[in-house]
């Protein structure tokens, strides 16, 4: 289509760290520039429908304009690239959502118990709020055997009950991985024989 869309913004789906800097680039298509009698100088950037001051723009070339944000403090920013033709008609070119948050902290205080006759359950401290979808995975292994990962549910992100039957009288190694769009961290590993973690009914 000639005008649909008129260009694009790069990156397309950015996730950025809170209080960091971020630059987006809007690139216009040739057909669109021709139709609207415009070039990158006619680009107007907006966040949440408010026009960004021109001082934050950089004209890269005749087809591309960039905008830079410093110290991003909002969790969600609707960013649109628009063109103003004839000084009066504003046409949307493209839009993205900038999602902001924090990388996960290293999980702490990992501990596990085995309720008698049941499977092992571990819990931990997940650290600060990241404002992003953060996945916690409990990993465990015995000697050279890796047990199935235990992925924490969204509603209980700081605990997980393993799927496998507990083995006793051998040491297993357990740790937690926390991952989101901004990074991945691993807790300290703990070693124990599950027999010493049994909690009588």
């Amino acid at each position: 289509e000639l005008l649909d869309p008129c260009g694009y913004i790069s990156p397309e789906s950015p996730v950025v760290q809170l209080h960091s800097n971020f630059t987006a680039v809007c690139v216009l298509k040739e057909k669109c520039m021709d139709y609207f009698h415009v070039n990158a100088n006619y680009i107007v950037w907006k966040t949440n429908h408010f026009t960004i001051p021109k001082e934050q723009y950089t004209i890269i070339n005749r087809t591309a304009s960039s905008v830079t944000f410093t110290d991003i403090a909002s969790l969600n920013i609707q960013l649109t690239c628009n063109i103003l033709t004839f000084g009066q008609l504003e046409q949307n070119v493209y839009g993205i959502t900038i999602i902001s948050g924090l990388p996960p902290e290293k999980p702490k205080n990992l501990s596990c118990i085995v309720n008698e006759g049941k499977k092992m359950r571990c819990e931990w401290d997940g650290g600060r709020e990241t404002h992003l979808e953060t996945n916690f995975t409990l990993k465990s292994e015995w000697a050279t055997h890796k047990f199935a990962d235990c992925k924490a549910k969204r509603d209980t992100p700081t605990s997980c009950t393993v799927d496998y039957s507990t083995v006793y009288f051998v040491n297993i190694e357990v740790w937690v991985e926390a991952e989101n769009a901004l990074g991945k961290v691993t807790s300290d590993h703990i070693n124990f024989d599950p027999v010493y973690k049994v909690k009588p009914n």
Partner: antibody
């Protein structure tokens, strides 16, 4: 071949409203802006306004308080409604495609005569 | 808004004549933003020229446009029977405005 087919002639009373339609065939409605232009009997041409499929509009300042343009993408039809009609609104109303560039009218409808008379 | 004034408002000419129609803008218009249309009685206008001198698809080479700033010209190098019509200039640098028209009649 692009074709713009407009609704039929209308006779209206002063103070009332008129809504004229323009159905686009043989080309994509989403590829261009669409304008309305009117011509009073024996007179020149006057641009009314333009619309894009997103609903983005741009009106002639002299008519903006009385004109509303809409688009129905499911039927590839756009509409121009003019309210508070007066006798000087009597004219042939044309829809037109803006191409090959914005502001240029390369395809036109056949015209719709709107007569405002008491 | 930009006013467009055409002259003459009408003219009589014969087949084969060279015809020149002028259009003056009330303020400077970018040469990218000027178009000419032909309209016959009871019909919709037809695009002839845009961007001052670019011919629209299918328009014969006898039609040409020129000019800059506030003064623009449409020339028909050799008038043909089918060219008897009314001609309008139009600027589209702001919201579009048209000239009052020039009627080309048979002498």
């Amino acid at each position: 071949q692009v074709q713009l087919v407009q609704s039929g002639a209308e006779v209206k009373k002063p103070g009332s409203s008129v809504k004229v339609s323009c159905k686009v065939s043989g080309g994509s409605i989403s590829s261009y802006y669409w304008s309305w232009v009117r011509q009073a009997p024996g007179q020149g041409l006057e641009w009314i306004g333009r619309i894009y499929i997103t609903g983005n509009t741009n009106y002639n300042p002299s008519l903006k308080d009385r004109v509303t343009m809409t688009v129905d993408t499911s039927t590839s039809t756009h509409y121009m409604e003019l309210s508070s009609l007066r006798s000087e609104d009597t004219a042939v109303y044309y829809c037109a495609r803006e191409g090959p560039k914005l502001g240029i009218f390369d395809y036109w409808g056949q015209g719709t005569l709107v007569t405002v008379s008491s | 808004d930009i006013q467009m004034t055409q002259s003459p408002s009408s003219l009589s000419a014969s087949v084969g004549d060279r015809v020149t129609i002028t259009c003056r803008a009330s303020q400077s218009v970018s040469s990218s933003y000027l178009a000419w249309y032909q309209q016959k009685p009871g019909k919709a206008p037809k695009l002839l020229i845009y961007g001052t001198e670019s011919r629209a698809t299918g328009v014969p080479s006898r039609f040409s446009g020129s000019g800059s700033g506030t003064d623009f010209t449409l020339t028909i190098s050799s008038l043909q029977p089918e060219d008897f019509a009314t001609y309008y200039c139009q600027q589209y640098g702001g919201y579009p405005t048209f000239g009052g028209g020039t009627k080309v009649e048979i002498k």
